[in-house]
Interface confidence: low
C-alpha cells in the first residue's frame, strides 16, 4: 500500500513565500492529487491545488504555482502577506490526498508548530519505481 509524505519549506529570508511538497512512495498509478490546508486562510479546509496527470492543474489563492516535481510528487508554492504568514502558520495543517490505482485515496497531513525548526520537514527518500 502506498505511503504519502508531506514536506513544507519556507525561505528563511522571505516568510511570505513557502512551498508544500508531497508525494507517494512506491509504484503507484496516480489519477488525482489534491493539496489543501486547514487553519491557514479561514476556518475549515481550503483547497489549494488539484493536479491531474493528464488534464493539468488548478490552483487557488494563496497558491501561486502548482506543478509535478516527479511522476509521483507535486509541489505547490504559496505567497501571502508576511504578517499573515507569521500569525497563521503556527495553526496550519497541510494535507495531500493522492488518488491512486488500485489502492484508492491516501491522505497525509503535516501540522506546523512554532517549534518546528525552519518549518521544514525532513526530506524522505524517493524510492519510486516508474517513470
Amino acid at each position: 500500500s502506498p505511503e504519502v509524505w508531506v514536506q513544507v519549506q519556507m525561505e528563511a529570508t522571505n516568510l511570505s513565500s513557502f512551498s508544500v511538497h508531497c508525494g507517494v512512495l512506491g509504484y503507484s498509478l496516480i489519477s488525482l492529487v489534491t493539496v489543501s490546508c486547514e487553519g491557514f486562510v479561514d476556518a475549515g479546509r481550503t483547497k489549494l491545488a488539484v493536479l491531474h496527470p493528464e488534464f493539468g492543474t488548478q490552483q487557488w489563492a494563496p497558491a501561486r504555482q502548482a506543478h509535478w516535481e516527479t511522476p509521483n510528487s507535486v509541489s505547490v508554492t504559496l505567497t501571502m502577506g508576511q504578517s499573515k504568514a507569521r500569525s497563521s502558520l503556527a495553526n496550519t495543517t497541510f494535507c495531500c490526498e493522492f488518488v491512486t490505482f488500485p489502492h484508492g485515496s491516501r491522505v497525509a497531513c503535516r501540522d506546523l508548530h512554532r517549534s518546528d525548526p525552519g518549518l521544514s520537514a525532513p526530506t524522505p527518500a524517493l524510492n519510486l519505481q516508474a517513470d
Partner: antibody, heavy 122, light 106 residues
Framework: EVQLVESGGGLVQPGRSLRLSCTAS????????MSWFRQAPGKGLEWVGF??????????EYTASVKGRFTISRDGSKSIAYLQMNSLKTEDTAVYYC?????????????WGQGTTVTVSS | DIQMTQSPSSLSASVGDRVTITCRAS??????LNWYQQKPGKAPKLLIY???SLQSGVPSRFSGSGSGTDFTLTISSLQPEDFATYYC????????FGGGTKVEIK
Amino acid sequence: EVQLVESGGGLVQPGRSLRLSCTASGFTFGDYAMSWFRQAPGKGLEWVGFIGSKAYGGTTEYTASVKGRFTISRDGSKSIAYLQMNSLKTEDTAVYYCARGPRRYTYGMDVWGQGTTVTVSS
Amino acid sequence: DIQMTQSPSSLSASVGDRVTITCRASQSISSYLNWYQQKPGKAPKLLIYAASSLQSGVPSRFSGSGSGTDFTLTISSLQPEDFATYYCQQSSTPLTFGGGTKVEIK
C-alpha cells in the same frame, strides 16, 4: 537508434546462479525505469521485475515467484541493467527480455531487447 | 493479483478481415491497459497504451477501446504482417498479461 541488447543467457544447473545484462543505447538511460520479463517455451509473457530511473531512487520491485532470488540493478555509467538470478529452478527456464519502462501516462514498455535464453537443467 | 483473461485463445482469419480480441480484468483497472504484438522468435512490440492510444509508428488499422474491466483490440483490415500473437497487459504491480491470442491464417 534506440536499442536494448540482452546477453548472459545459457545452460545452468538448478541451484546455481546466472547474471543477465541489458545494454542500452540511443537514449538517456538514467531517465528510464527498466523492466525484465520472461517467456517460458510455448507460454505467455511474465513480468519479472523492474528498477526505477536514476531520478526516482533506482529502487526495485519483483514478482512473487522470484522475490529473494533475483536482483535487478543498473550501472548508469555503462547504460546497463542487470538481472542477477540466484538459486535457479527448472521453472525459471525461459527467454528473458529487458524492456524500457514502465513510463508515466502510458505505463507501457515501448522498447524491448531481442531476448536471451536461460535453460535451467541438470 | 489482477488476473487478465483474453479471448479467444486463437483465431483463424483472412487478409482484409476485421479482427476483434477481448481482454477482461478480474477487477477494475481504469484505462491502465496495454496491447502488444509478438511474432515467433521475436520480442513483443507495444501497439496500444492506456487502453486506446496508438503507439507511435503503429498502423492506424490497430485500435483499442474499453475501460474498467473490459477491453478490446481491433484490427480493422488484417494484413499479412499482422499474423502473430497478441497480449494485453495491466499496469498495476505485479504487472500481469493475458494468456495471448494467436491470429492464424485461414
